[in-house]
Amino acid sequence: KEPKFTKCRSPERETFSCHWTDAVHHGLKSLGPIQLFYTRRNIQEQTQEWKECPDYVSAGENSCYFNSSFTSVWIPYCIKLTSNGDTVDGKCFSVDEIVQPDPPIALNWTLLNVSLTGIHADIQVRWEAPPNADIQKGWMVLEYELQYKEVNETKWKMMDPILSTSVPVYSLKVDKEYEVRVRSKRRNSRNYGEFSEVLYVTLPQ
């Protein structure tokens, strides 16, 4: 089985990494070393200048990491995997297409009010943007999606995406425990990042 790209991801538009599957040959790793080559646009060069991955270590096994010196959102990239000189997989993209922010952090909640009947309560959930997202300068404008559910349920309820880092959640049952999680994406992007750690909400009787 030949290696294949599984994912390229940029957490903050300033670096990115690409990952691929192991090469497997009859249950053993392929003898040919896997190399990643990349090229940035091909207008001036008469022939495409392919350069080898600058860092095979930082993003883990079967990966290539491009630090900020190798990353620009203003040019197209093409990458290819080679084994014994043969190309086994390839793809082209712009950095903005692979932006998937790190999870939001520091989730917490406060009680807003309890219904007159004492059956339902409203809460305010707050969080912080991923630390590496440069949101102050507008380089990363993030949209957040909050999901919640009762602890014993399997289906998450999704709230509409918002730009703020806090949102009220209405009509929770006071005798239940809830799980809340938040993820983000760059505005106008299609790719959400991973969810935050789950916040557990237990409403007082």
Partner: antibody, heavy 115, light 108 residues
Framework: EVQLVESGGGLVKPGGSLRLSCAAS????????MDWVRQAPGKGLEWVAE??????????YYAESVKGRFTISRDDSKNTLYLQMNSLKTEDTAVYYC??????WGQGTLVTVSS | EIVLTQSPGTLSLSPGERATLSCTAT???????LNWYQQKPGQAPRLLIY???NLASGIPDRFSGSGSGTDFTLTISRLEPEDFAVYYC?????????FGGGTKVEIK
């Protein structure tokens, strides 16, 4: 040989609109990222907008100074790039260059915004 | 955004002399994403050097580029009459693409 030919410039009153066109040849236009860059009389160069290829979802980007007023678009079947300019201001007066990812440039078309 | 400051604003030299043009960025720019352009009166800019030090096609080797971080240099080893023009540096690394204010190389 890469060729970029702009047209559509002219004199327009403040608040008015204008649409610039750029006819491209000598390269695979549908694969190209295209930009508009402008130059006010006697001044330096200012990047205005970019549109990417279909493979890159025709994503568009704008300078803050034109965001919400200018729209970059393309017609790959006609090998043509466009810049729709609305709510024009006197400070938009400039020669507008069509560029292939800022590597190859057309000769430019002059836009004058004046009452 | 990254602001590029070019110096000097004007450089007065004679043909055959060496020209050294400077471009300073307000924050670090990867050498892969810095270009130089030449513009003659009434003409469009022309790409001279891409990625700090690579000559664009058809550009004579009397032009060279160097630098890293925040400081970049365009050098013309021996000025020819056709080299008198305005030169712009350009970065497309971070923020939106920006250009320097230009250096005019004029005949002394």
């Amino acid at each position: 040989e890469v060729q970029l030919v702009e047209s559509g410039g002219g004199l327009v009153k403040p608040g008015g609109s204008l649409r610039l066109s750029c006819a491209a040849s000598g390269f695979t236009f549908s694969d190209a990222w295209m930009d508009w860059v402008r130059q006010a009389p006697g001044k330096g160069l200012e990047w205005v907008a970019e549109i990417r290829s279909k493979a890159n979802y025709h994503a568009t980007y704008y300078a803050e100074s034109v965001k919400g007023r200018f729209t970059i678009s393309r017609d790959d079947s006609k090998n043509t790039l466009y810049l729709q300019m609305n709510s024009l201001k006197t400070e938009d007066t400039a020669v507008y260059y069509c560029t292939l990812i800022r590597d190859y440039w057309g000769q430019g078309t002059l836009v004058t915004v004046s009452s | 955004e990254i602001v590029l400051t070019q110096s000097p604003g004007t450089l007065s030299l004679s043909p055959g002399e060496r020209a050294t043009l400077s471009c300073t960025a307000t924050s670090s720019v990867s050498s892969s994403y810095l270009n130089w352009y030449q513009q003659k009166p009434g003409q469009a800019p022309r790409l001279l050097i891409y990625s700090t030090s690579n000559l664009a096609s058809g550009i004579p080797d009397r032009f060279s580029g160097s630098g890293s971080g925040t400081d970049f240099t365009l050098t013309i080893s021996r000025l020819e009459p056709e080299d008198f023009a305005v030169y712009y540096c350009h970065q497309y690394h971070r923020s939106t693409p920006t250009f320097g204010g230009g250096t005019k190389v004029e005949i002394k």
